[in-house]
Interface confidence: low
């Protein structure tokens, strides 16, 4: 069935910033998709087109991207009469029309909005759930429910505390199924809230953009200690492990790292990549840390390579790879990490996201599907993670509706699959291993 009409509009994301929403119509109905937005964007990712008109939304409007959809992309796709199941053809056509390497003509937010809506329409056209359609597009015969990685303590550039490292996550790998993983996550989260309230006061339990807490702590080890305590209090020491997103590019300073970068600059306290690696190794030894994202700067290739070779844990590339096949190829070649963080808006189309995932998996990497800090009620990534069988998703704490929208959709998918539902559990790094 071909596309009858496409209409885009400006809506708001969870941080109150404009973003793109697309309505796509076929004879089967209306298919709606909204595009997420990152607070920090890597220098190697596809361009999110903003208006830069300071008189409107502090320059963050997306009316240009919306106009590109309504005036250029929509007429082209409607006139081509392409079937909505032809995801690759449609994405390729938009990429070709844009004609730039980083989608800077139309904006990745324009192309992705249409791409997501096409994917949703394609599933209905085939009469299958969205996750099954995505599995087909990826060449997967199985579908798998992921382990959720709940970001429950926030630090880094966007938190008002002194904590250098950006995210401290809990992963309920010992759960029997996704529903139990949600229960464990929620119970640990509420225990953590009480622990923080007792130790740092009620204000410390205000939540950040992704639903996590940002208590005023400086030591990263203290963040891990809080998690260990909350996990223990909830009674899940044997079922929950810890993940971190360090976002080290944020405190990289001329070949060294400043773990106190939120204080006045003092180069004498910077540490070397080797010293930072030793700090991570002490975390791994003292806490159940199984995954570290962006442990080094996005261009500190040597440090990545050395650490990945010497640590037995999952090393996730986000700023390093930005879901970009060329960056992934380099990282694979140099054995820089062993897991890809997959963010659809970093590359800007469903097809390229699937290709990036395939490229990573083909080289034995894990893949973690991720939200962005500026989210909407759209639940596409929940179906994406199931269809791609990546086994892991991070989409915030079990708090804030735009985060729960994804987790709730995963609950529905598990229920729909019934006895056929398979949960990644402790195999979250390689859920399809024979």
């Amino acid at each position: 069935m071909s596309i009858l009409k496409i209409h885009a509009r400006e809506i708001f994301d969870s941080r109150g910033n404009p973003t793109v929403e697309v309505d796509l119509f076929t004879s089967k109905g209306l298919f709606r998709a909204a595009v997420p937005s990152g607070a920090s964007t890597g220098i190697y990712e596809a361009l999110e087109l903003r208006d830069n008109d300071k008189t409107r939304y502090m320059g963050k409007g997306v009316s240009k991207a919306v106009e590109h959809i309504n005036k250029t992309i929509a007429p082209a796709l409607v006139s081509k009469k392409l079937n909505v199941t032809e995801q690759e053809k449609i994405d390729k056509l938009m990429i070709e029309m844009d004609g730039t390497e980083n989608k800077s003509k139309f904006g990745a937010n324009a192309i992705l909005g249409v791409s997501l809506a096409v994917c949703k329409a394609g599933a209905v056209e085939k009469g299958v759930p969205l996750y099954r359609h995505i599995a087909d597009l990826a060449g997967n015969s199985e579908v798998i429910l992921p382990v959720p990685a709940f970001n429950v303590i926030n630090g880094g550039s966007h938190a008002g505390n002194k904590l250098a490292m950006q995210e401290f996550m809990i992963l309920p790998v010992g759960a029997a199924n996704f529903r139990e993983a949600m229960r464990i996550g929620a119970e640990v989260y509420h225990n953590l809230k009480n622990v923080i309230k007792e130790k740092y006061g009620k204000d410390a339990t205000n939540v950040g953009d992704e639903g996590g807490f940002a208590p005023n702590i400086l030591e990263n080890k203290e963040g891990l200690e809080l998690l260990k305590t909350a996990i223990g209090k909830a009674g899940y020491t044997d079922k929950v492990v810890i993940g971190m997103d360090v976002a080290a590019s944020e405190f990289f300073r001329s070949g060294k790292y400043d773990l106190d970068f939120k204080s006045p600059d003092d180069p004498s306290r910077y540490i070397s990549p080797d010293q930072l690696a030793d700090l991570y190794k002490s975390f791994i030894k003292d806490y159940p840390v199984v995954s570290i994202e962006d442990p080094f700067d996005q261009d500190d290739w040597g440090a990545w390579q050395k650490f990945t070779a010497s640590a037995a844990i999952q090393v996730v590339g986000d700023d390093l790879t930005v879901t970009n096949p060329k960056r992934i190829a380099k990282a694979v070649n140099e054995k820089s990490c062993n897991c890809l963080l997959l963010k659809v808006n970093q590359i800007g189309s469903v097809t390229e996201s699937l290709q990036a995932c395939k490229l990573a998996q083909a080289n034995g990497w894990g893949v973690m599907v991720s939200h962005r800090s500026g989210e909407t009620e759209d639940t596409f990534i929940a179906d994406l993670v199931v269809g791609l069988c990546t086994g892991q998703i991070k989409t915030g704490a079990p708090c804030r509706s735009e985060r729960l929208a994804k987790y709730n959709q995963l609950l529905r998918i598990e229920e729909e699959l019934g006895s056929k539902a398979k949960f990644a559990g402790r195999n979250f790094r390689n859920p399809l291993a024979k």
Epitope: E96, G139, N140
Partner: antibody, heavy 119, light 107 residues
């Protein structure tokens, strides 16, 4: 070093099926996608499809859909390509080719298996 | 499907010559192009990927250029072992398709 060793030549009658094997060594079998490419006598190369041994995901060239099945046996690091309802124009050398670290590049090839379809 | 067209389909040259083979895609494939070398009775060998990158072990006399729809394979100084058939192939999504080949013969 990486090696892909294919099964021997086959002669088949029209309408029959053929199953070609490709045994991989020198690398972790599940870490690379395996493609199949064929070459008719004196002709160019034609991509048939791929299988990802990591998750058994397959993608076939539309031209062969319904006639081709690609499978793997990770315990023996072997990939298989079965082609059904053979016709005389399926006479070709069939190659398995390991996909390099960038998708769509074939950095190692099997020696080829000649399949002759003749009545 | 994306069509790949090579030219010339055959060419004769001498050892030491500089040779250029071109490949045209029916639509924009950015730099998603690979070149292979094939000798009679042998499997193809990867020569260049991503339009211009040489894998380890490929002599530097081989070079690739181009992006979008027009690509070139250049051999700066032909050696006896370079006489073979050369194929281009796009890897901008599936189905991957090959050019019809360019046969390089000794003059």
């Amino acid at each position: 070093q990486v090696q892909l060793v294919q099964s021997g030549a086959e002669v088949k009658k029209p309408g029959a099926s053929v199953k070609v094997s490709c045994k991989a060594s020198g690398y972790t079998f599940t870490s690379s996608v395996m493609n199949w490419v064929r070459q008719a006598p004196g002709q160019g190369l034609e991509w048939m499809g791929y299988i990802n041994p990591y998750n058994d995901g397959t993608k076939y060239n539309e031209k062969f859909k319904g006639r081709v099945t690609m499978t793997t046996d990770t315990s023996t690091s072997t990939a298989y390509m079965e082609l059904r309802s053979l016709r005389s124009d399926d006479t070709a050398v069939y190659y398995c080719a390991r996909e390099g670290f960038y998708y769509g590049n074939f950095d190692n090839w099997g020696q080829g298996t000649l399949v002759t379809v003749s009545s | 499907d994306i069509q790949m067209t090579q030219s010339p389909s055959s060419l004769s040259a001498s050892v030491g010559d500089r040779v250029t083979i071109t490949c045209r895609a029916s639509e924009n494939i950015y730099s998603y192009l690979t070149w292979y070398q094939q000798k009679p009775g042998k499997a193809p060998k990867l020569l260049i990927y991503n339009a211009k990158t040489l894998p380890e072990g490929v002599p530097s006399r081989f070079s690739g250029s181009g992006s979008g729809t027009d690509f070139t394979l250049t051999i700066s100084s032909l050696q006896p072992e370079d006489f073979a058939t050369y194929y281009c192939q796009h890897h901008y999504g599936t189905p991957y398709t090959f050019g019809q080949g360019t046969k390089l013969e000794i003059k």
